[in-house]
Each structure stands twice: as structure tokens, then as C-alpha cells.
Amino acid sequence: TTPEPCELDDEDFRCVCNFSEPQPDWSEAFQCVSAVEVEIHAGGLNLEPFLKRVDADADPRQYADTVKALRVRRLTVGAAQVPAQLLVGALRVLAYSRLKELTLEDLKITGTMPPLPLEATGLALSSLRLRNVSWATGRSWLAELQQWLKPGLKVLSIAQAHSPAFSCEQVRAFPALTSLDLSDNPGLGERGLMAALCPHKFPAIQNLALRNTGMETPTGVCAALAAAGVQPHSLDLSHNSLRATVNPSAPRCMWSSALNSLNLSFAGLEQVPKGLPAKLRVLDLSCNRLNRAPQPDELPEVDNLTLDGNPFLVPGTALPHEGSMNSGVVPAC
């Protein structure tokens, strides 16, 4: 017997649908109506035929009461080819829901997104996460999607993007965005970061994650942040192959004084990089290739320093830095 495509847990909290049949019974998803967190995986299906069955131009207000009754706070949609018109139709209807977090993964968005009608209500998301989503519209996709969202977005995550650079002149500011995660875009690089960090469009960023993004030096990242006017409190550069030395011809970069936490773990560093901020609350240098204990003059003034998992650290040796957070146990790096 074929397993049920949708499973709702016994607490009405989590509902997961895996539609793998060529002609799935979408009505099965109705059992998710009382779930708080919903995941729908469409098995790579092309949802184009849906456009014939739904009126994408219908006034979504007619569904308002039905949608308001949904408990869903977090929705994940994955593995499908979705016409932009259908995506927009869904966003318009979900604007009447309690949805706060939306994740789109492994999607191919086809066609262009129509402009937001004057009477339409934007979706009041606090978090939007995109992973491996391709858009037919290329660089303008963020601006097109943004118009369907209210301006209160706090968390934006874009991974495995086909076009991580945005059409900055079309993008409006994200006034409430405090966390931007561009991790897992290995082709981004420092020049790409400059293109992605549209100047003055991210005025409230506190946390910036750039894991596995092809960054080369902390100084290069500093320059990109300075150019964009982005002043994060916390910066994650882990899982990049970082060079410790700075190009002598490159101008010195002054880090923002707002930065107090820097993650340089898993960065292949054989020595402490030059050009780090002068003062930090947290510096993570764990799981690098440091062959000797860093000298005080190589390090910023730092409250919490993590050096676990470096070759020079033999379990049980004295901690190399006052106030460090080393456990004395080499983690699995």
C-alpha cells in the first residue's frame, strides 16, 4: 500500500506532506489545516496545471475568514516548478493568515511576478528563507518578491542562490531586517558580496552570516561592509578558505565599532589574520590550522576567545589566552 502523503503529529503541531505521485491528491493536505508548522514537498512536480484550476486573479478577501482560521505560523514549500502567478496568488491569500515564517527550497519560479494591486495587503512575515530557488526574472527577483511583503521582515536567508546579486536600484529598504544570511553561496566572493549588499537598503542589520561564500580575507569583507554602510554586531565568516595575509596594495579598512562578535572557525587559517577589529567581545578561531598559540599582539582585545581544535592545542595544556573559552578537549573538526 502507498504511504499517506501527509502526516500530522498527535499534537496538531507539525504536519509534513510528501507528494511523490505523478498525479497527487492535493486534498490530502487538508489534514494540515490545524498544524502550526507545515512542510509541503511536491516531489519536483510542475505546478503549471494548477493555474487552470484556480483563478489567480480572484479577490483573495473572499478566502479571508477561511485562511484566518489556519493555525500555521511556519510554512515550508519545496521541490516544485511554480509559475510566478501561482506564487503570487498564494502570497495574496496567505496575507490573511497568521503566517510568520516562510521557507522556499528547491523551487524553480517560472514567468514574471505581476505588480502588487493597489488594494492588496502584503504578507506580514518576520522570516523568509530561500534555498536553491531559481527565478526566471534574474536579478530583479528580490524587488519583485519584496513588493508582496510588508516591511517588517526581520530575517532573510538566501542560500544556493542562482543569482545572489540583486538589482539594487529596484530593491526598497528593509527597515526592520536584523539578520541577513547569505551562507552557502560559494560563488559569491567579496565582489559578489558588494553587489548583494545594496547600499543603505539594510540599515538595521545586526547579524550577518557569510558561511561558505568564497570570502578570501576579513579585510575584503570589511571593505564590502563599509561600502554598503552595513554595520553588523555579529559576523560569521566560518567555513571560508581565508587568507591570513592582506594584499599590501589594498587600503586598510576600519571595522565598524558596532562589531562585537566574529566567527572565523573552519577557515583553514595557519595564523591569526591581519586586519581584525581592535576590540571584540567574542572571537571564534576554533577548528583552524594554527600551529602555535597566538601572541597577544596578534589578537584583538577580546573577552571570549575560542581556539579549540587547532593543532597546537594538546588536550590538557594550559589555556593560551586569559578569559578564553577553550574546553581543553579537541572537538571533531
Epitope: 503529529d9 499534537e11 489545516v33 490545524s34 508548522e37 493555525r71 515564517e101
Partner: antibody, heavy 115, light 111 residues
């Protein structure tokens, strides 16, 4: 059998940050459900503080949102509560609880805010 | 926020009596076919214990003298034959919409 156990200091000074940890055994905090903090001031009713879900998503009571952070350590199967800028009004028994119909409770820990 | 108002705030009844506690919500706590209203019993110095979930479902291990009913905004907890061990404070709680809220409690005593 699922068990939850709260731990943390029983006395916190005004204006400081209250920090509690809940250790879960008999179930994984990253596989399902919501993992909540609920408090009860002495002789008063129950107040939901917030949750962190199996996915890492959080939801907070708006009345406390500006002061609350709930986080988790999946490697230790623990979730934690931080409540900043505490006053005497935050004196309460703090419970960690599983689900949104609250079927599994820790035994509770009394936190007193006093100088 | 959804406000839950319990009545009475306290009550005294004799062993064997049928006891009813009501809970009224400021707006509907129904989502489609389910009412997300639950009932708890709390004894002094102990954590609350789930009695009834989704308005009418008896939690495993709870005596069958406890029952629940209601939908949308009006709900009832009934103890068909009061026992001495039922002395406690009873709370209703909604999980239809965050913030998840509790009633103010009903203190039940034996005459």
C-alpha cells in the same frame, strides 16, 4: 518516558538577566513539538512565556518579547530561557513544558528576584 | 490576545457531587474541526497536569469522571462525582493562537 528538568540560579538581582536551562530526556527536542517556558508567580495564575520548536523557530509572548530569548543546544538536548532586566514582578516558579497542549511539565524551579 | 474567563473563581462542593466549571473565550478558539481549548488540574506545590485536550478528549491516565465539552467560545469541565483527591485549582488554556493564554483559575474545595 519523556522527562523535563529545569536548572538555574534561584536568586537573581534586579536589573540582571535570569537564565534557566531545561534538560530533556526520553525524547529529542529537534525531532518534534514545541518546547515552552511557562511561569507562575507565587499565589497567582499561569503565564506562557514562549517556545522554541523542533525546527528552531521561536514564538514569544508579546508582553515579554523585548526581554526574552529562548535558545537550544541540540547536542545536549537542552533548551534555555534568558529574561533580561528583571524586577520583583518576575519572581515566579518557572516551568519547562512540551507541546502546545501542555502534557509534559518539569517540576518547576522558583526564581526570586531580590537584591 | 484571547482572554479566557473562568467561572466560578472558587467553589465548594461535597464528595459525590457533580461539579461544573466554565471557561469563556473572548474570541473563537476553533480551527476548522478542532477546538484548541485544554483543561489542567494543579495541586499545591506541584506542576499542572493535563486533564482534557481539544475541549473533550480525556488525557491518558486521567479518571473518566472528568469530561469536557464546548466549542468556539464556551467550554465546560465537568467532574461527574467529586472525590477528595480532586481538591485543586483548575485552569483552562487555549492554543489556537499565540500568545497562548490561561484562564485565571478555579479553586475547588470539599465542603
Amino acid at each position: 518516558q519523556l522527562q523535563l528538568q529545569e536548572s538555574g540560579p534561584g536568586l537573581v538581582k534586579p536589573s540582571e538577566t535570569l537564565s534557566l536551562t531545561c534538560t530533556v530526556s526520553g525524547g529529542s527536542i529537534s525531532s518534534d513539538s514545541a518546547w515552552n517556558w511557562i511561569r507562575q508567580p507565587p499565589g497567582k495564575g499561569l503565564e506562557w512565556i514562549g517556545y522554541i520548536s523542533y525546527s528552531g523557530s521561536t514564538s514569544y509572548n508579546p508582553s515579554l518579547k523585548s526581554r526574552v530569548t529562548i535558545s537550544r543546544d541540540t547536542s545536549k538536548n537542552q533548551f534555555s530561557l534568558k529574561l533580561s532586566s528583571v524586577t520583583a514582578a518576575d519572581t515566579a516558579v518557572y516551568y519547562c513544558v512540551r507541546g502546545l497542549r501542555f502534557a509534559y511539565w518539569g517540576q518547576g524551579t522558583l526564581v526570586t528576584v531580590s537584591s | 490576545d484571547i482572554q479566557l474567563t473562568q467561572s466560578p473563581s472558587s467553589l465548594s462542593a461535597s464528595v459525590g457531587d457533580r461539579v461544573t466549571i466554565t471557561c469563556r473565550a473572548s474570541e473563537s478558539v476553533d480551527s476548522y474541526v478542532n477546538a484548541f481549548l485544554h483543561w489542567y488540574q494543579q495541586k499545591p506545590g506541584k506542576a499542572p497536569k493535563l486533564l482534557i485536550y481539544r475541549a473533550s478528549n480525556l488525557q491518558s491516565g486521567v479518571p473518566s469522571r472528568f469530561s469536557g465539552s464546548g466549542s468556539r467560545t464556551d467550554f465546560t469541565l465537568t467532574i461527574s462525582s467529586l472525590q477528595p483527591e480532586d481538591v485543586a485549582t483548575y485552569y483552562c488554556q487555549q492554543s489556537n493562537e499565540d500568545p497562548y493564554t490561561f484562564g485565571q483559575g478555579t479553586k475547588l474545595e470539599i465542603k
